[in-house]
């Protein structure tokens, strides 16, 4: 890959179904606009979970996605996925594209295995 | 002498703090007494979690251990560890010793990473 993307190998979602993990890339180059895509790998298929483009001014991303949020600082993106349930357990890959200025660089992390356990329902209060 | 012990690489504890996984060994030989030990690896240190000896008649083990239970069938042990909390997340290894009749065989699995998420407390009922 043109750039190296690192992300943790395993993350546990909280009992509220929230998983947070960093996605870092190097070398960072001199980049004004960076596109970050979160993909889920199931078998041999990749599906896009969410994507956003960060700029120097726009360091909070994924505003169009209710389940994703992220902040950008230099060459590190802190990603949060919420609303996760046990069926969402799987491998989540972080893809980074250095969009502007040219040249175009792209890199993909090895993936973060997110484990999600559904909470037991609380007993009804009488 | 060595035997091959297999166990799953990852298991999620339920929201009640219960984790179950199989521990299988091969070749099975013709064995009357099999000792199974569950060890937890933290850093370079191994600590014994629980241990039991299965026989043809005694196929339910770990009676002296409140947090472990297990059943034995041919060359497979189904292990259950309960009372787990997030701090117990770690690598749990299954050790199998073919105790009787001779010759003595021993084998150790590569470990099962057990992930435990503490549940959120339920709101107090008024």
């Amino acid at each position: 890959e043109a750039i190296q993307v690192t992300q943790p190998s395993v993350v546990l979602a909280s009992s509220h179904g929230v998983a947070s993990f960093p996605c870092e890339y190097s070398p960072s180059h001199n980049t004004d606009e960076v596109r970050v895509t979160v993909l889920r790998q199931t078998n041999d298929q990749m599906t896009e979970v969410c994507a956003t483009t960060f700029t120097e001014k726009n360091t909070v991303g994924f505003l169009d996605y209710p389940f994703c949020s992220g902040t950008f600082n230099e060459s590190r993106v802190n990603l949060t996925i919420q609303g996760l349930r046990a069926v969402d357990t799987g491998l989540y890959l972080c893809k980074v594209e250095l969009m502007y200025p040219p040249p175009y660089f792209v890199g993909m992390g090895n993936g973060t295995q997110i484990y999600v356990i559904d909470p037991e329902p609380c007993p009804d209060s009488d | 002498e060595a035997i091959q012990v297999t166990q799953p690489s990852v298991v999620l504890a339920s929201s009640h703090g219960v984790a179950s996984f199989p521990c299988e060994y091969s070749p099975s030989h013709n064995t009357d007494e099999v000792r199974v030990t569950v060890l937890r690896q933290t850093n370079d240190q191994m600590t014994e979690v629980c241990a039991t000896t299965f026989t043809e008649k005694n196929t339910v083990g770990f009676l002296d251990y409140p947090f472990c239970s297990g059943t034995f069938n041919e060359s497979r042990v189904n292990l259950t560890i309960q009372g787990l909390r997030a701090v117990d997340t770690g690598l749990y290894l299954c050790k199998v010793e073919l105790m009787y009749p001779p010759p003595y065989f021993v084998g150790m699995g590569n470990g099962t990473q057990i992930y435990v998420i503490d549940p959120e407390p339920c709101p107090d009922s008024d």
Partner: antibody, heavy 114, light 113 residues
Framework: EVQLVESGGGLVQPGGSLRLSCAAS????????IHWVRQAPGKGLEWIGI????????KYAQKFQGRVTISRDNSKNTLYLQLNSLRAEDTAVYYC???????WGQGTLVTVSS | DIQLTQSPSSLSASVGDRVTITCRAS??????????LDWYQQKPGKAPKLLIY???NRATGIPSRFSGSGSGTDFTLTISSLQPEDFATYYC???????????FGQGTKVEIK
């Protein structure tokens, strides 16, 4: 399906200006840099310039500096090319392409002639 | 300015032939360890189609008979077994950082013998 559709081509007088549009669909337009490239009849490809995803940055080939402006309206998923002081040698098919040149429009022909 | 020179400018070949097109840059197009040189196919009246990026990576959906190689200043596009749909014009394209600019080779027309 990713689609880029150029429009605005036609006959232009020498010395005049042109404003071409490139309508995008099938992808998050605001997430990608876009290029303009042209091709004179029977000739090769010529890069004009690129605009950043946000529209905050542009870079142009030296040949076009001062004569070209690339802009975009992310709310309309549309890219624009403004080319001034047109001469006969600007006659070409003008293409928009999504960075990094994986997707291209079908092109629009501009003819500069009196 | 970096110039890109393709050779040959045209060639005639038959279906099943192995075809090689070269592209030479007037100075290195390597940048951060990557060769920023791409290859495109263009058919009459159609937009160019990306075949190979970063000198040797096949673009999505491109058949394995297309391959690219090279680094620095000398690059090659190879079609291992020419198919009827491969008769077209092929362009190499480079990115240079100073000044930041993309330039194309003059093209190689592959015709039916």
């Amino acid at each position: 399906e990713v689609q880029l559709v150029e429009s605005g081509g036609g006959l232009v007088q020498p010395g005049g200006s042109l404003r071409l549009s490139c309508a995008a669909s099938g992808f998050t337009f605001s997430g990608y840099a876009i290029h303009w490239v042209r091709q004179a009849p029977g000739k090769g490809l010529e890069w004009i310039g690129i605009i950043s995803p946000s529209g905050g940055g542009t870079k142009y080939a030296q040949k076009f500096q001062g004569r070209v402006t690339i802009s975009r309206d992310n709310s309309k998923n549309t890219l624009y090319l403004q080319l001034n002081s047109l001469r006969a040698e600007d006659t070409a098919v003008y293409y928009c392409a999504r960075h990094p040149f994986a997707y291209w429009g079908q092109g629009t022909l501009v003819t500069v002639s009196s | 300015d970096i110039q890109l020179t393709q050779s040959p400018s045209s060639l005639s070949a038959s279906v099943g032939d192995r075809v090689t097109i070269t592209c030479r840059a007037s100075q290195s197009v390597d940048f951060y360890g990557i060769s920023f040189l791409d290859w495109y196919q263009q058919k009459p009246g159609k937009a160019p189609k990306l075949l190979i990026y970063d000198a040797s990576n096949r673009a999505t959906g491109i058949p394995s008979r297309f391959s690219g190689s090279g680094s620095g200043t000398d690059f090659t596009l190879t079609i291992s077994s020419l198919q009827p749909e491969d008769f077209a014009t092929y362009y190499c394209q480079q990115y240079v950082s100073s000044p930041p600019e993309y330039t194309f080779g003059q093209g190689t027309k592959v015709e039916i013998k």
